[in-house]
């Protein structure tokens, strides 16, 4: 897994008029890290984890950068010609990565009303766009504006690759992010489903990194995919992740089913609580 920094900026227009506020979200290694969501941007770390990475300093630098980026994106939205009545959004997603072999990747993507219309590889400066005529029109529009306005938006659009990587390296220096492993808490619950059946759910939370195996087994054998339901692996707001898997089983057969969990080379099995007990919590060994 490479280390990554991802900026997600969104600006809005209403009836052709660009709104003053903007939303910026920054993800570090896939985790919510910083956020600006006010008219006046103030970079806010997302949880203790982000504060630990940033250290005991003010976030003036982040606030300044994110505010500047937001202003530039608002200018870009103002130059999109075909804005119709109602609410419209322009979104810019910028990602940079540092891989284990120290190679780097950087890219930038533009979305209008949630639809991708322009991408750039920030290393090769190569632009790509979808085939649809709407996307092509929007892409030409934005690219022309970026060329015309190159001086004003120079910092934003030309130093992005270097800036993003520089910031990522700075955050990684904190040591908090570096390849830590946090084991999950596993929690098995049961609920009545229908006559003679129960639904058993296995939840894993508070783990890092995000790669995890979670599945139900009957007598030690994995159930097929189509007999299980999986939740997405999602950030839980604490710099860690959570997910779940559920299946339906016959009442009275609970003891034959176990939730199997594997994470960062460690593994454990968790039984279904029997009878009236609703929750069984256990840390794996």
């Amino acid at each position: 897994e490479p280390h990554s920094l991802r900026y997600n900026l969104t600006v809005l227009s209403w009836d052709g008029s660009v709104q003053s506020g903007f939303l910026t979200e920054v993800h570090l290694d896939g985790q919510p890290f910083l956020r600006c969501d006010r008219q006046k941007c103030r970079a806010k770390p997302q949880g203790q984890w982000a504060e630990d990475v940033l250290g005991n300093k003010t976030w003036d630098r982040e606030t300044r950068d994110l505010t500047g980026n937001g202003k530039d994106l608002r200018m870009t939205l103002a130059h999109i010609k075909d804005q119709k009545e109602g609410l419209h959004s322009l979104q810019e997603i910028r990602v940079c990565e540092i891989h284990e072999d120290n190679s780097t990747r950087s890219s930038q993507h533009f979305y209008y009303d949630g639809e991708l219309f322009l991408s750039q590889n920030l290393e090769t400066k190569e632009w790509t766009m979808p085939q649809s005529s709407r996307a092509q029109t929007l892409a030409m529009n934005v690219r022309n504006f970026l060329k015309e306005d190159a001086m004003k938006t120079k910092t934003h659009y030309h130093a992005m690759h270097a800036d993003c990587l520089q910031e990522l390296r700075r955050y990684l220096k904190s040591g908090v992010v570096l390849r830590r492993t946090v084991p999950p808490m596993v929690n098995v619950t049961r609920s009545e489903a229908s006559e003679g059946n129960i639904t058993v759910t296995c939840r894993a939370s508070g783990f890092y990194p995000w790669n995890i195996t979670l599945s139900w087994r009957q007598d030690g054998v994995s159930l097929s995919h189509d007999t299980q339901q999986w939740g997405d692996v999602l950030p839980d707001g604490n710099g860690t992740y959570q997910t779940w898997v559920a299946t339906r089983i016959c009442q009275g057969e609970e003891q034959r089913f176990t939730c199997y969990m594997e994470h960062s080379g460690n593994h454990s099995t968790h039984p279904v609580p029997s009878g009236k007990v609703l929750v069984l919590q256990s840390h794996w060994q």
């Epitope: 087994r217 009957q218 007598d219 030690g220 054998v221 994995s222 159930l223 097929s224 007999t227 057969e253 003891q255 034959r256 199997y260 594997e262 080379g265 593994h267």
Partner: antibody
Framework: EVQLVESGGGLVQPGGSLRLSCAAS????????MNWVRQAPGKGLEWVSY????????YYADSVKGRFTISRDDARKSLYLQMNSLRDEDTAVYYC?????????????WGQGTLVTVSS | DIQMTQSPSSLSASVGERVTITCRAS??????LNWYQQKPGKDPKVLIF???SLQSGVPSRFSGSGSGTDFTLTISSLQPEDFATYYC?????????FGPGTKVDIK
């Protein structure tokens, strides 16, 4: 006493079909997952197919996928293996085996086996 | 797919001797490992399940250990009826792969 008795083996030409049966007794068949395992003459054991209780989960070895079909009839306490497009390399003794309750995917009882010979 | 290897492929031992057979998985299989004994012309019998649990009715001279990728079957004092072929089998994946077997014969 737990008993598994296979039948249906025999000599068949390449490309031909056979249906193996496994009759179970001495236990509540419907509450156990079952398997077919084979052993070529003078060779080791090779798992072929798995079927869970209520037939909700079925797995096949890559070597037989698309050619063999496992099924069960809980009322008749029987396990079946329909073998189509048979090849020379399918020649083996075929065992049916029960999965142990609350084990680790353990085959706790096996039948005596039935020999399938694929040859022209 | 998970590959299972066993060593040695065969061994000669005397009655009363301690015998150790090892089984290695190409990737971690947790404790999802079973050991079987098969005598010529007979069906296999399970000895050990879940890497180290002794199957009911199996003599206590048989024991299993290991987790992850490396596993061991030990016969503390070989008896005449123990001369057979021993197979390990993984059940972590849905391939239920058997090892190639270890033949134990009389020295």
């Amino acid at each position: 006493e737990v008993q598994l008795v296979e039948s249906g083996g025999g000599l068949v030409q390449p490309g031909g079909s056979l249906r193996l049966s496994c009759a179970a007794s001495g236990f509540t068949f419907s509450t156990y997952s079952m398997n077919w395992v084979r052993q070529a003459p003078g060779k080791g054991l090779e798992w072929v197919s798995y079927i869970s209780t209520r037939s909700s989960t079925i797995y096949y070895a890559d070597s037989v996928k698309g050619r063999f079909t496992i099924s069960r009839d809980d009322a008749r306490k029987s396990l079946y293996l329909q073998m189509n497009s048979l090849r020379d390399e399918d020649t083996a003794v075929y065992y049916c085996a029960r999965v142990m309750v609350r084990g680790s995917g353990t085959f706790d009882y096996w039948g005596q086996g039935t020999l399938v010979t694929v040859s022209s | 797919d998970i590959q299972m290897t066993q060593s040695p492929s065969s061994l000669s031992a005397s009655v009363g001797e301690r015998v150790t057979i090892t089984c290695r998985a190409s990737q971690s299989i947790s404790y999802y490992l079973n050991w079987y004994q098969q005598k010529p012309g007979k069906d296999p019998k399970v000895l050990i399940f879940a890497a180290s649990s002794l199957q009911s009715g199996v003599p206590s001279r048989f024991s299993g250990s290991g987790s992850g990728t490396d596993f061991t079957l030990t016969i503390s004092s070989l008896q005449p009826e123990d001369f057979a072929t021993y197979y390990c089998q993984e059940s972590h994946s849905i391939r239920f792969t058997f090892g190639p077997g270890t033949k134990v014969d009389i020295k």
